[in-house]
């Protein structure tokens, strides 16, 4: 037999079908010019020592072969003995290691078989009524095609599907969309209406994310508040990466899951902007305020479920940083200014009440006063911190109040509102004999003691009603008892107690009269 002809004999190798999974596959045959034809195929498995034979059976029942050697492509003319105007069936037999491996057959009319291209270039992917829609430009001069797709997940083999006939400048396909796993798709085309025409090669992989992006499994930790009033939010655990099918590993455009961090600053609700969305890779610094943090996963089909955490407020307090002066016109707060042109947010809420009851006020941008202090004043009529109770005050500062991540905590402290000097007056002062020249004075704790850091000390005053001599005794804010000694029997005394704050002297309690009885010996 001549090499250019199809040889009408049995091929020159023993007859031994391997039934192996490897071997020749994806045979495609088509006309490449007016009188020339080409068949090509793929071979899976080790290629050393493999000889390929293109087999052909004609409608008459005669069968022949072309010897292709180690090549997986073979050209022949319309004079090679293969009928090109009638239906023929072709397949490849590969002889290797004393066994024959056979490809699936293709049955076609060679003359009418045109080489079709797979979808080339950009394949657009969208979601349509719970399904996947793929769309692409029809390759030039190839309108009229049958289209198939195959798809697989990381854990499943290829499954074949049909896109149906296409007859336009753009072609499309509806495919199944998986809820929770990524998929790899490939498409192929063949001439429409040409019986047995060969399929094109498979297209490049189209990588498609699951309909639901994976829920982010991450953990955060928050560092201690630094000297600058900010604390860093750090990611303890990276989000798990989506498992990808084989052809999508490495560079897989389309399957990307983007994780975004959504910050919601709960404190200081009177500021302009309460939420900010950032890339997860860019971990922000936060003030000491309370925040809700959500990690939102999204892919090309939109956002998925999010995971939310609450970051509580930093409750570390600065007992002396805030000065408060109460005058007839109202109240003014002073604190060390941060920098030039700072906006401050002053937030207060009654202690022991829900965080939702916080009130706040935003200052206009202000520069430090000559003493380097920033101030905030309010009148009694405003009702701010007007009730006689303990308030928790936090002051935040920002040079760019519209940027959520640029706030810092200036200070947190407690303040007793209303008329603190009167409200803090100790009650239930009682005197008990202690010895021949001393008494024990007790009182109920001042309301100021409910406000951490506010009560600086108690002062106990003792007045000798005879000599009008007065002595004052400072008492630690944690104590509610003192012993007065050096007293004389038979003399009338009055005792009073007051509660002082760092910036305010308290009001004396009602005078309590007492005397030590003269002891008469028998």
């Amino acid at each position: 037999c001549r090499t250019s002809e199809c040889c009408f004999q049995d091929p020159p190798y023993p007859d031994a079908d391997s039934g192996s999974a490897s071997g020749p596959r994806d045979l495609r045959c088509y006309r490449i010019s007016s009188d020339r034809y080409e068949c090509s195929w793929q071979y899976e498995g080790p290629t050393a020592g493999v000889s390929h034979f293109l087999r052909c059976c004609l409608s008459s029942g005669r069968c022949c072969y072309f010897a292709a050697g180690s090549a997986t492509r073979l050209q022949f003319s319309d004079q090679a003995g293969v009928s090109v105007l009638y239906t023929v069936t072709l397949w490849v037999e590969s002889w290797a290691r004393n066994q024959t491996e056979k490809s699936p057959e293709v049955t076609l009319q060679l003359y009418n078989s045109v080489k079709y291209e797979p979808p080339l270039g950009d394949i657009k992917v969208s979601k349509l009524a719970g399904q996947l829609r793929m769309e692409w430009e029809t390759p030039d001069n190839q309108v009229g095609a049958e289209v198939q797709f195959r798809h697989r997940t990381p854990s499943s083999p290829w499954k074949l599907g049909d896109c149906g006939p296409q007859d336009d400048d753009t072609e499309s396909c509806l495919c199944p969309l998986e809820m929770n796993v990524a998929q790899e798709f490939q498409l192929r085309r063949r001439q429409l209406g040409s019986q047995g025409s060969s399929w094109s090669k498979w297209s490049s992989p189209v990588c498609v994310p699951p309909e639901n992006p994976p829920q982010p499994q991450v953990r955060f930790s928050v560092e201690q508040l630094g000297q600058d009033g900010r604390r860093r939010l750090t990611l303890k655990e990276q989000p798990t990466q989506l498992e990808l099918p084989e052809g999508c590993q490495g560079l897989a455009p389309g399957t990307e899951v983007t994780y975004r961090l959504q910050l919601h600053m709960l404190s200081c609700p009177c500021k302009a902007k309460a939420t900010r969305t950032l890339h997860l890779g860019k971990m922000p610094y936060l003030s000491g305020a309370a925040y809700n943090v959500a990690v939102i996963s999204s892919n090309q089909f939109g956002p998925g479920l999010n995971q939310t955490w609450h970051i509580p407020a930093d409750t570390h307090t600065e007992p002396v940083a805030l000065n408060i002066s109460v005058g007839t016109n109202g109240t003014t707060m002073y604190w060390p200014a941060r920098a030039q042109s700072m906006t401050y947010c002053i937030e207060w809420q009654p202690v022991g009440q829900d965080g939702g009851l916080a009130t706040c006020s935003l200052t206009a941008p202000q520069d430090p006063d000559p003493a380097g202090m920033a101030t905030y004043s309010w009148s009694r009529e405003s009702g701010a911190m007007g009730q006689e109770k303990c308030y928790y005050i936090t002051i935040f500062a920002s040079a760019h109040p519209e940027k959520l991540t640029l706030w810092s905590t200036v200070l947190s402290t407690y303040h007793f509102g209303g008329n603190a000097s009167a409200a803090g007056t100790p009650h239930h002062v009682s005197v008990k004999n202690h010895s021949l020249d001393s008494v024990s004075v007790d009182w109920a704790p001042s309301l100021l003691s409910t406000c951490p850091g506010v009560l600086k000390e108690y002062v106990v005053r003792c007045r000798d009603e005879d000599s009008k001599q007065v002595s004052e005794h400072p008492v630690q804010p944690t104590e509610t008892q003192v012993t007065l000694s050096g007293l004389r029997a038979g003399v009338a005394y009055t005792v009073q107690v007051r509660a002082d704050t760092a910036w305010l002297r308290g009001v004396w309690s009602q005078p309590q009269r007492f005397s030590i009885e003269v002891q008469v010996s028998d």
Epitope: F8, Q9, D10, D15, A16, D17, C57, S60, R62, C63
Partner: nanobody, 114 residues
Framework: QLQLVESGGGLVQPGGSLRLSCAAS????????MSWVRQAPGKGLEWVSY????????TYVDFVKGRFTISRDNAKNMLYLQMNSLKPEDTAVYYC???????RGQGTQVTVEP
Amino acid sequence: QLQLVESGGGLVQPGGSLRLSCAASGFTFSSYGMSWVRQAPGKGLEWVSYISAGGGTTTYVDFVKGRFTISRDNAKNMLYLQMNSLKPEDTAVYYCVHAADGSRGQGTQVTVEP
């Protein structure tokens, strides 16, 4: 000289089965691939199936795959075609063919009708 004689045809209902046989003589049967072809009324020849000399390789046209099975017994010089799930469109004269030189027998008629 080379001779091929087909038998086993007949009338069968749709969904039924037939087994065609082809007795070969006048050549070394075990050295050649063999085919079955058919010719429906008013149509040209149509190749149906092929089997290699040793029987290790079998091939079918798409529209009979899964329904027809080609086999051979080289000791008896016999070629067979087992036809299951027959359809009206399988109605034709079936010929066995020497795949190398195209020689064929006189054929056997298969008719599939309700």
